[in-house]
Amino acid sequence: EVEKTACPSGKKAREIDESLIFYKKWELEACVDAALLATQMDRVNAIPFTYEQLDVLKHKLDELYPQGYPESVIQHLGYLFLKMSPEDIRKWNVTSLETLKALLEVNKGHEMSPQVATLIDRFVKGRGQLDKDTLDTLTAFYPGYLCSLSPEELSSVPPSSIWAVRPQDLDTCDPRQLDVLYPKARLAFQNMNGSEYFVKIQSFLGGAPTEDLKALSQQNVSMDLATFMKLRTDAVLPLTVAEVQKLLGPHVEGLKAEERHRPVRDWILRQRQDDLDTLGLGLQGGIPNGYLVLDLSMQEALS
C-alpha cells in the first residue's frame, strides 16, 4: 500500500473525540497533531482506541517528548501505558501518587509486568523513601510486592500496611524478610483475640522468635505442619516436646512424616528420647537416656 502522508480534506482533528475511533492508523498519524494529543490526554482513555491505534498515538508522543513525557501527560496515559517499554519509563520523573495509582489501575488484576516494576522503582527512587502512603498504595495493588523488597527497605513498612497482605503474598519471602515483617504483623494484629490473631499472624510466623512460639503453645492454636515446617530452625530448637505437642495439637502426628526434614530433624536431635517416646509416634534420633547435654555454643562464646 502506498504511504499516505497528507491528511484528507476535512479530517484534521480539532479535538480528541470519539470520531477518531474510525481513523485508520495512517489517518491518525497524518491528522492528529501531537501537541493537541498531549494537551487532551485526559480524553484518550475515555475513547476505546484499539491496540494498534495506540501505537500511532505513542509514536506521536515519543516524537514530541524524546527526553521523556511530562507528568501531566503520564497521569492520563491510561491504556496507552500498556504500550510503554521499561526503557520509555526510565525517562520519566513520576512524583505524584495520583499518577502512580492511575497507571497501576490500568494493570489491575494482572501480574506485575516489567513496565510496572520499572514504574514503581522510578517512583520510589524519585521520592527517596518508601513512605506510608506509597506502601499503602503498592500493597493494595500488589501485596506480593513486599517480598520483592530488601530487609532494609522493609524496615520502613508501616504496620498498617500489613493488613492488606494475603497468605499467598508471602510465599516468595525468605526468612530474612519475614524476620522484619513478623514484628510489624505482631504489632498490627495485637488487639485481636487469640484465635483471630493466630489466623492473621500464621503467615508471618517464619519470622517468630522462640518466646512467641512458646506463648502460642499455651493458646490451643493447633498449628498445621505446613506452618510448622516454615518456622525458623533456631526458634524451634529450644521448644520442649510438651510445647511442640501443645503448639501442634492434633497435627502433632504429622511430625513422623517430616522427621527427616528441617526443622523437625534438628529439633528431634535436641530432645531426650524418653520425651519423644511420650508422643507415641515412633520418632527416633533423640538423646539417649543418661546422656548429659552440653551447650557447646555457650562454651565457645566464653572462651
Partner: antibody
C-alpha cells in the same frame, strides 16, 4: 458470573421502530463498553456501535447513523438499542455484547440474541 | 472498512480428523484477530484472540495462527460437539468487521 439477558422476539412493519433491551448482571455495569452486533438469517455478523454506560458516550457505525440510538438505564443495569425506519433487510438477530479490555475489542460476553422480523 | 474473507464457506470433516478454516484480511491487521464458534440457536462464543491465544476454557485442539493478512483456525481432532459456524473478526481498527462464517459439519 457475567450474564446479558435480552428482551424477546419482535415482529415489526416496515417504517416502524424497535427497541431491544439487554439486562446485565455479574459485573459492574458502568465499567465496560456495551456493543451491539446483528446477524441476518444465515449471514455473518455485523457490528453496529457501542455505548459507554458510565458516560453515555456512543459511537455508531456510519451504516446505521441516523437510524440507531443506544441508551442505558444505570439504575437497572440495562442497555437499549432502538432502530427506526425499519426495512425488510433489518430482519436479524440483534445481540448485545461486552468487551472487557477496550484496547482489544474482542467480544468476551454475548446476550442470547433478540430476533427482530420486519414484514408487511 | 477492512473486509475479512473466510474460506471455505462450508467444510465436512470426519470425526478425529483435522479441520482448517482460513480468513484473509483486506489490509494488514497485525495479530488483531479473534475467532468465534456459534452453535445452532446459540450466540457466538469467543475461542481465540490475538490470532493465537486461546480464551479461558477452550480445548487445546483449537489452534489459531497467522499475522498480517492471513489467518487460520485449526481443529486438530474434530469432535461431535465442534459442529458449528466459525467466524473470524478483526479488531485492528473500527468498524470492527467479521468474516461471513464457515459452516463445519461431520462427514
Amino acid at each position: 458470573q457475567v450474564q446479558l439477558v435480552q428482551s424477546g422476539a419482535e415482529v415489526k412493519k416496515p417504517g416502524a421502530s424497535v427497541k431491544v433491551s439487554c439486562k446485565a448482571s455479574g459485573y459492574t455495569f458502568t465499567s465496560y463498553w456495551m456493543h451491539w452486533v446483528r446477524q441476518a438469517p444465515g449471514q455473518g455478523l455485523e457490528w453496529m456501535g457501542w455505548i459507554h454506560p458510565n458516560s453515555d458516550n456512543t459511537i455508531y457505525y456510519e451504516k446505521f447513523q441516523g437510524r440507531v440510538t443506544m441508551t442505558v438505564d444505570k439504575s437497572i443495569s440495562t442497555a437499549y438499542m432502538e432502530l427506526s425506519r425499519l426495512r425488510s433487510d433489518d430482519t436479524a438477530v440483534y445481540y448485545c455484547a461486552i468487551i472487557i479490555t477496550p484496547v482489544v475489542p474482542k467480544f468476551d460476553y454475548w446476550g442470547q440474541g433478540t430476533l427482530v422480523t420486519v414484514s408487511s | 472498512d477492512i473486509v475479512m474473507t473466510q474460506s471455505p464457506d462450508s467444510l465436512a470433516v470426519s470425526l478425529g480428523e483435522r479441520a482448517t478454516i482460513n480468513c484473509k484480511a483486506s489490509h494488514d491487521v497485525g495479530q488483531s484477530v479473534a475467532w468465534y464458534q456459534q452453535k445452532p440457536g446459540q450466540s457466538p462464543k469467543l475461542l481465540i484472540y490475538w490470532a493465537s491465544t486461546r480464551h479461558t476454557g477452550v480445548p487445546d485442539r483449537f489452534t489459531g495462527s497467522g499475522s498480517g493478512t492471513d489467518f487460520t483456525l485449526t481443529i486438530s481432532s474434530l469432535q461431535a460437539e465442534d459442529v458449528a459456524v466459525y467466524f473470524c473478526q478483526q479488531y485492528s481498527s473500527y468498524p470492527l468487521t467479521f468474516g461471513a462464517g464457515t459452516k463445519l459439519e461431520i462427514k
